[in-house]
């Protein structure tokens, strides 16, 4: 066979040349358009090992370049104006002779973030080394050069044909070539398949003989999706040689004739074609035997088949039909399991989300997070769950126990707390004296005092009503006990007495404001918001000065 | 690390030009794009145009066209931008960002016109 | 020319979850416009935050993102912290041209 001046790989319905030239991407392309082809795609792992091997042909052509590295135009472009898109496996690039976007990607390096100028890709390779089938070359992003200006390292480029179909290689049955003359104007004898309407010019004969012969065929569409030479039998067939030279031209099996002659013939399972030379099988697969989604698969030598199921299907006990695998047998998720049709799906439980380690991975959700406690007070996470709790002088309330209700320590069960009067506020409660007599150190007694005719000491004056969150401490006569909100550590003596401000002033109360309230001797304060440490109040003089605060992250700390 | 510095603060007649620099240090200069931009208490930010050092390419805002020229200088990493034909609407901070992500800013560039 | 378009100003909390968003006059944003997000601090310190819709600029901590809610580019601040008090821009690509917006002004009380 003669040497081949071009590299050329035809497989599938494209054909891929590989030429030298340092050009720009635009000259490529117009090189490759003039041939009614555009500059390469490489659309999957597949298209990649079809332009790998014509790359390869190319670097066998010629001897080792002193350039380490080169690069060869591919058609993927991004046109000026368009930004870099990272969220796309083609990065917002698309491929020049059109055609969809695909995931197949094998960029060299991070692309650079840019608008502005067109960008065009090249493949990268080191020519010093040999292409290994396992290592795809590599995509470069980069400008697209101008005449006379390719670009750094710019060697060549790829172009890709594509046809409706592909005849399979002439077969000789004796000494011959076959010369195939391309579409794209590319000569070659030695092509695993060649492009619809290619010429083949079949010389047969020794080469220094006069016996040599000439055929010419063409590539032709015979019947939609077939396609064939138009000849019969097998080529440059001779008596001298019989089945002994290249098995006659013969696809699978060959027989000779007593005269010299002989004839083709294909092994079980599979049929002679009308060029008389191939086989192909007899499709155990025609009468559709397989159901439910099934891809029927034909056995070796035609004879039977095997029914194969998408992912996530398994073949029943007839093995024709698919049925749903329940991925849930294997327990792949954390939690709970839900069965799809061909797949599955995980759930996390109430109070779990998904996250953390492994496919199918579920993490607590931490309800007490910063900015989403369901708690009107404290907020406690556990697995799964959380549970709420209410300072001292609150009991959890709400039908979901998230809510906080304050305990009026006037009527507790306890019986009376206070000697004289008791005044229950927010959280707490004070204790009060009837006028004449005050209230003692201890803040629970009262003490006869200097004779007075005005209202008894203890509840505050009107001006307190509704008073604000971060207020001084109110007038002293009253007093609060000492406990969580306002100070005192959770061990606190059952016998509580209020706390009394050492510099508080003793003030009096119009009689309007008390009104009597269960036992006699017993008031009730009118509805006061009484500032605890935790929302801004001063600390409490006197007594156990602990005092509730909270952190930074949200959890409760003492002071 | 990254840097953009950008030439001192200019004071300019209208009608003058005035030709601004941004001196880029800390990476490779023609891998990324440099983009102009300016602020003024009128329009907020408005971007003016932006280069590829590597090509030459341009782009700008219509509306600065022909008030704008961008160059970049590849031996000395330097971006420059000259204004042409300057009035008091121009009076405003000029900054140069690199890449088309505006990833970082120079300190910025006061050029007030006046006469 | 289109016209970009921010909240003017947005107030959050400590540790809160805050997003900011960006309109184009011209549709829907997306991954085409290339949505960039950048923060500027008092005299004129500006920082690129986000880039080409949702890429972290280098140095840029976690709690910056970048998405397309809906028919907008949108900026999530999760976990806001007190620093975060800044005006923000985002800027769109049109072909050949970027817009910027107004800016947010993001108060973290």
């Known amino acids: 066979t003669g040497a081949d001046t071009e590299a050329v790989v035809c497989a599938g319905t494209a054909c891929y040349t590989a030429h030298w030239g340092k050009l720009s991407a635009a000259e490529a392309q117009n090189l490759c358009l003039q041939n009614g082809g555009n500059l390469a795609t490489v659309k999957s792992e597949e298209e990649a090992q079809h332009v790998q091997q014509v790359l390869a042909q190319l670097l066998r052509r010629e001897a080792a370049l002193t350039a380490r590295m080169g690069k060869f135009w591919i058609g993927l472009q991004r046109e000026k104006g368009k930004c870099l898109d990272p969220s796309l496996p083609l990065k917002g690039f698309s491929w020049v002779g059109g055609g969809e976007d695909t995931p197949y990607s094998n960029w060299h390096k991070e692309l650079r973030n840019s608008c502005i100028s067109k960008r065009c890709v090249s493949l990268l390779l080191d020519l010093s080394q040999p292409l290994l089938p396992g290592r795809l070359p590599k995509w470069s992003e980069g400008p697209c050069g101008s005449p006379g200006s390719p670009g750094s390292n710019i060697e060549g480029f790829v172009c890709k044909f594509s046809f409706k179909g592909m005849c399979r290689p002439l077969a000789l049955g004796g000494p011959g070539q076959v010369t195939y003359t391309t579409p794209f104007q590319t000569t070659s004898s030695s092509l695993e398949a060649v492009p619809f309407a290619s010429a083949a010019n079949v010389a047969c004969g020794e080469g220094d003989k006069d016996d040599s012969q000439s055929h010419y065929f063409l590539c032709k569409e015979k019947a939609p999706d077939v396609f064939d030479w138009g000849s019969s039998g097998p080529l440059c067939v001779s008596p001298k040689y019989g089945c002994n030279f290249n098995n006659g031209g013969c696809h699978q099996d060959c027989f000779e004739g007593g005269d010299g002659s002989f004839l083709c013939g294909c092994r079980p399972g599979f049929r002679l074609l009308d060029d008389l030379v191939t086989c192909a099988s007899r499709n155990p697969c025609s009468s559709s035997p397989c159901r439910g989604g099934a891809t029927c698969i034909p056995g070796p030598h035609g004879k039977n088949y095997t029914c194969r199921c998408p992912q996530g299907y398994q073949l029943d006990s007839s093995q024709l039909d698919c049925v749903d695998v329940d991925e849930c047998q294997d327990s792949p998720c954390a939690q709970e399991c839900v069965n799809t049709p061909g797949s599955f799906r995980c759930e996390c439980w109430v109070g779990y989300e998904p996250g953390g380690p492994g496919e199918g991975a579920c993490q607590d959700v931490d309800e007490c997070a910063l900015g989403r406690s369901p708690c009107a007070q404290g907020c406690t996470n556990t697995e799964g769950s959380f549970h709420c709790s209410c300072e001292e002088g609150y009991v959890l309330a709400g039908e979901d126990g998230t809510q906080c209700q304050d305990v009026d320590e006037c009527v507790g069960p306890g019986g009376p707390l206070c000697d004289s009067l008791c005044f229950n506020t927010q959280g707490s409660f004070r204790c009060g004296c009837l006028p004449g007599w005050v209230l003692a150190p201890n803040g629970v007694s009262c003490a006869m005092g200097p004779v007075s005719l005005g209202p008894p000491s203890g509840p505050p004056d009107e001006e307190y009503k509704g008073e604000r969150e971060g207020s001084t401490v109110p007038p002293a006569a009253t007093a609060s006990p000492t406990r969580g909100p306002e100070g005192t550590p959770k061990s606190t003596p059952t016998t509580r007495r209020p706390l009394l401000s050492s510099d508080a002033p003793i003030t009096s109360v119009p009689l309007e404001v008390l009104a009597p309230s269960g036992s006699p001797g017993l008031w009730r304060e009118p509805s006061i918001h009484h500032t605890t440490a935790a929302s801004g109040a001063q600390e409490p003089a006197g007594g156990d000065s602990s005092v509730a605060t909270q952190n930074d992250d949200g959890t409760d700390g003492q002071k | 690390q990254v840097q953009l510095q950008q030439s001192g603060a200019e004071l300019v007649r209208p009608g003058a030009s005035v030709k601004l620099s941004c001196k880029a240090s800390g990476y490779t200069f023609t891998d990324y794009e440099m983009h102009w931009v300016r602020q003024t208490p009128v329009h907020g930010l408005e971007w003016i145009g932006g280069?590829?050092?590597?090509?030459?390419?341009?782009a700008y805002n219509q509306k600065f066209k022909g008030k704008a020229t961008l160059t970049a200088d590849k031996s000395s990493s330097t971006a420059y931008m000259e204004l042409r034909s300057l009035t008091s609407e121009d009076s405003a901070v000029y900054y140069c960002?690199?890449?088309?992500?505006?990833?970082?800013w120079g300190q910025g560039t006061l050029v007030t016109v006046s006469a | 020319q289109a016209v970009v378009t921010q909240e003017s100003a947005l107030t959050t909390s400590p540790g809160e979850t805050v997003t900011l968003t960006c309109r184009s006059s011209?549709?829907?944003?997306?991954?085409?416009?290339?949505a960039n997000w950048v923060q500027e601090k008092p005299d004129h310190l500006f920082t690129g935050l986000i880039g080409?819709?949702?890429n972290r600029a280098p140095g840029v901590p976690a709690r910056f993102s970048g998405s397309l809610i809906g028919d907008k580019a949108a900026l999530t601040i999760t976990g806001a912290q007190t620093e975060d008090e800044a005006i923000y821009f985002c800027a769109l690509w049109y072909n050949n041209h970027f817009v910027f917006g107004g800016g947010t002004k993001l108060t973290v009380l």
């Open positions: 960002t690199r890449g088309a992500w505006f990833a970082y």
């Open positions: 080409g819709t949702n």
């Open positions: 011209t549709g829907a944003v997306t991954t085409s416009n290339s």
């Open positions: 280069i590829d050092p590597e090509t030459g390419g341009t």
